[in-house]
C-alpha cells in the first residue's frame, strides 16, 4: 500500500493524497491518517483533497485499508508534508503613533512573500476599531491620511490577503493617540469698510488663534455686560462674527475667547468707537435787523445735530463756495459775511466728517438798500 503526496506545499495550495494498492484487492474500507488521527474513511480507494492548505495541515500522513476482519490490515508508507508560509503575518507601522492633530499620518501594512512565490499578488485593507479606512481593499500596502483629529485616536490594524482570497492574515492592533495642541495667543481684530466702524455699516469681529488644533469654539463678549454675543465652533484658526448694521450703542469694549477642550484662552480687550455720519445740517442766518441790508454783517451758522467730530462745514451762496469752518469737537460753525447788493440769493451749508457729506436746505436772502438786488444785473434769459 503506497501513499502518494507532495512533501512541500504553500499555504493556500490544494493537497491531493493518493492511496494506491493492488487493483484486485478486496477492501472493506480505507482511511487517511494524519499524525495517527483518522482523517477520513472511504468504502473504496479514493483520493483525499485538502482544498486550501494551512500551516496546521503540516504533519505525517499515511493511509490504511481494512479487509474482512475488523483490524486495519495494511498500512502505507508515511509521507511528511510541510506547509510553508506564503507570506508573513503583516505588521502595521505608522509614520507616527502620536501624531499632532490636524497633521498627516501614513500607515503601512508590511509583510514578506516567500522567495519561491514572489509572483503571488496581495491586497491590503486598513481598519480603525472595526471601521474600514480609505476606500477599502487596495493593492497598495500604504494608506495616507491627510489629517487626523482627536476623534481618530484608537486601535488600528491591517489585513493582507491573496487576490484569490485563499489566504488572509491580520496584523496585531496598534494604538494611535492623536495629540491635541492647546490654544495659544488669541487676538480680536476689527474689520470695517474703510478701516473705521461707522453707524449703519457692516462690522466684522475676527477672533484668531496663533496655534491650537481640533475643533475650536470661538465666542465673542461685550466687556460691559460680559454676555456672549455669539459662538462658533469650527476646525480653523479664526472665526468671524458679523454685525450687519452697527448702531451707535454698539460702541464699547469687546473681547473674544477660544477653546479647544483644554484651557479657554481670552483675547485682550479691544475698544470699538462707532463713528456717526453727519445728519442733515441746519443753516441759521443772523443779521442785525429783521431785513438784511447792504453793509450788514450776516452770520451764517451751520450745525449738524448728529455726527462724530471733527466736522468740516462749508458755506455756499448759490453754487459758490464762500468758505469753510471746522468744528473739532463737534457742534456747529459760523461764517460771517459783509453784505453787498449782490449777496441776495440762496444760501446753504454742507457738513462733512469724512463719512459722507450732507447739505442743508437752501435759505433765501434778499438785500434791501440802494440798488436793491437784481440777480447779477441780468435781465436776458438763456
Amino acid at each position: 500500500l503506497t501513499l502518494v503526496a507532495p512533501s512541500s506545499v504553500f499555504e493556500g495550495d490544494s493537497i491531493v493524497l493518493k492511496c494506491q494498492g493492488e487493483q484486485n484487492w478486496k477492501i472493506q474500507k480505507m482511511a487517511y491518517h494524519k499524525d495517527n488521527k483518522e482523517l477520513s474513511v472511504f468504502k473504496k480507494f479514493s483520493d483525499f483533497l485538502i482544498q486550501s492548505a494551512v500551516l496546521s495541515d503540516s504533519g505525517n500522513y499515511f493511509c490504511s485499508t481494512k479487509g474482512q476482519l475488523f483490524l486495519w490490515d495494511k498500512t502505507s508508507n508515511i509521507v511528511k508534508i510541510k506547509v510553508q508560509e506564503l507570506f508573513q503575518r503583516p505588521v502595521l507601522t505608522a509614520s507616527s503613533f502620536q501624531p499632532i492633530e490636524g497633521g498627516p499620518v501614513s500607515l503601512k501594512c508590511e509583510t514578506r512573500l516567500s522567495p519561491q512565490r514572489l509572483d503571488v499578488q496581495l491586497q491590503f485593507c486598513f481598519f480603525r476599531e472595526n471601521q474600514v479606512l480609505g476606500s477599502g481593499w487596495s493593492s497598495s500596502p500604504e494608506l495616507q491620511i491627510s489629517a487626523v483629529w482627536s476623534e481618530d485616536t484608537g486601535s488600528y490594524w491591517c489585513k493582507a490577503e491573496t487576490v484569490t482570497h485563499r489566504i488572509r492574515k491580520q496584523s496585531l492592533q496598534s494604538q494611535i493617540h492623536v495629540q491635541r495642541i492647546p490654544i495659544s495667543n488669541v487676538s480680536l481684530e476689527i474689520r470695517a469698510p474703510g478701516g473705521q466702524v461707522t453707524e449703519g455699516q457692516k462690522l466684522i469681529l475676527l477672533c484668531s488663534v496663533a496655534g491650537g488644533t481640533g475643533n475650536v469654539t470661538f465666542s465673542w463678549y461685550r466687556e460691559a455686560t460680559g454676555t456672549s454675543m455669539g459662538k462658533k465652533t469650527q476646525r480653523s484658526l479664526s472665526a468671524e462674527l458679523e454685525i450687519p448694521a452697527v448702531k451707535e450703542s454698539d460702541a464699547g469694549k469687546y473681547y473674544c475667547r477660544a477653546d479647544n477642550g483644554h484651557v479657554p484662552i481670552q483675547s485682550k480687550v479691544v475698544n470699538i468707537p462707532v463713528r456717526i455720519p453727519v445728519s442733515r445740517p441746519v443753516l441759521t442766518l443772523r443779521s442785525p435787523g429783521a431785513q438784511a441790508a447792504v453793509g450788514d454783517l450776516l452770520e451764517l451758522h451751520c450745525e449738524a445735530l448728529r455726527g462724530s467730530p471733527p466736522i468740516l462745514y462749508q458755506f455756499y451762496h448759490e453754487d459758490v463756495t464762500l468758505g469753510n469752518s471746522s468744528a473739532p469737537s463737534g457742534g456747529g460753525a459760523s461764517f460771517n459775511l459783509s453784505l453787498t447788493a449782490e449777496h441776495s440769493g440762496n444760501y446753504s451749508c454742507e457738513a462733512n466728517n469724512g463719512l459722507g457729506a450732507q447739505c442743508s436746505e437752501a435759505v433765501p436772502v434778499s438785500i434791501s438798500g440802494p440798488d436793491g438786488y437784481r440777480r447779477d444785473l441780468m435781465t436776458a434769459g438763456v
Partner: antibody
C-alpha cells in the same frame, strides 16, 4: 448808467510805487464789491484782489500780497490800488471791475509801464 | 488754485460760420463759469455767466454750455464784430477767481 473811470497811463521807474484810481458812477458805490485785475502783455488776466467799499474789507490773491494795496474813498466813490516796489514784471494794464463773483462792469484800464 | 485751460490760442473762422471756443477746468467748478469778449485796446465785456446764462444786451448768437470741468462758448453766424479775444473765468471758491489764457478769433 454804471461807469468805472480809471486814471491815465503811468510811466514809473523800477523800485518806485504808484497809485491807480477807479471812480465809480451810476450806482451806489458802497453796495458792490470792487475787484482789480491785471492783464500782462501776454494777454493773461489775473485777479489781484477785492475790496468791499462799505467797510474797506480786502481779500488778496496770495501772489499779490505785499505788491498791491486796495483802498476806497467813499466820499468820492473812488477805489484805489497802490502798486509797491515796481519791477518790469509789473508792466501791464490794470483794470478795476465791479462784481461779486463775475464782472459785468469794467473800467477802461490803466497802462503801467515800469522802465528806467 | 483752479487752472482754466483754453487749449486753442487762435481760431480761424469765416463770417457766417459757427465756432466753438472751449475751456477746461482743473477741477469741478459746477457751473460757476463766465465768458468775456475783449477787443484790442478795450476792456473785457461780460457775455455769459453761470456757464449758460446770457448777460443782458448780449446777442443770442452767443451760447454757453457745459458743467463740471468742460465748458464751451459757441458763436453761431459769426459777424465781423465778433473777431476778438475770448476769456473764460471760474468763480467756484470765493474769492480765488482764475481766468483762461484766452482764445483769439480771426478771419480765415
Amino acid at each position: 448808467e454804471v461807469q468805472l473811470q480809471q486814471s491815465g497811463p503811468e510811466l514809473v521807474k523800477p523800485g518806485a510805487s504808484m497809485k491807480i484810481s477807479c471812480e465809480a458812477s451810476g450806482y451806489s458805490f458802497t453796495a458792490y464789491i470792487m475787484n482789480w485785475v491785471k492783464q500782462s502783455r501776454g494777454k493773461n488776466l489775473e485777479w489781484i484782489g477785492l475790496i468791499n467799499p462799505y467797510n474797506g474789507e480786502t481779500t488778496y490773491n496770495q501772489k499779490f500780497k505785499g505788491k498791491a494795496t486796495l483802498t476806497v474813498d467813499q466820499s468820492s466813490s473812488t477805489a484805489y490800488m497802490e502798486l509797491l516796489s515796481l519791477t518790469s514784471e509789473d508792466s501791464a494794464v490794470y483794470f478795476c471791475a465791479r462784481g461779486l463773483y463775475w464782472f459785468p462792469y469794467w473800467g477802461q484800464g490803466t497802462l503801467v509801464t515800469v522802465s528806467a | 488754485d483752479i487752472v482754466m485751460t483754453q487749449s486753442q490760442r487762435f481760431m480761424s473762422t469765416s463770417l457766417g460760420d459757427r465756432v466753438s471756443v472751449t475751456c477746461k477746468a482743473s477741477q469741478n467748478v459746477i457751473t460757476n463759469v463766465a465768458w468775456y469778449q475783449q477787443k484790442p485796446g478795450q476792456s473785457p465785456k461780460a457775455l455769459i455767466y453761470s456757464a449758460s446764462y446770457r448777460y443782458s444786451g448780449v446777442p443770442d448768437r452767443f451760447t454757453g454750455s457745459g458743467s463740471g470741468t468742460d465748458f464751451t462758448l459757441t458763436i453761431s453766424n459769426v459777424q465781423s464784430e465778433d473777431l476778438a479775444e475770448y476769456f473764460c473765468q471760474q468763480y467756484t471758491n470765493y474769492p480765488m477767481w482764475t481766468f483762461g489764457g484766452g482764445t483769439r478769433l480771426e478771419i480765415k
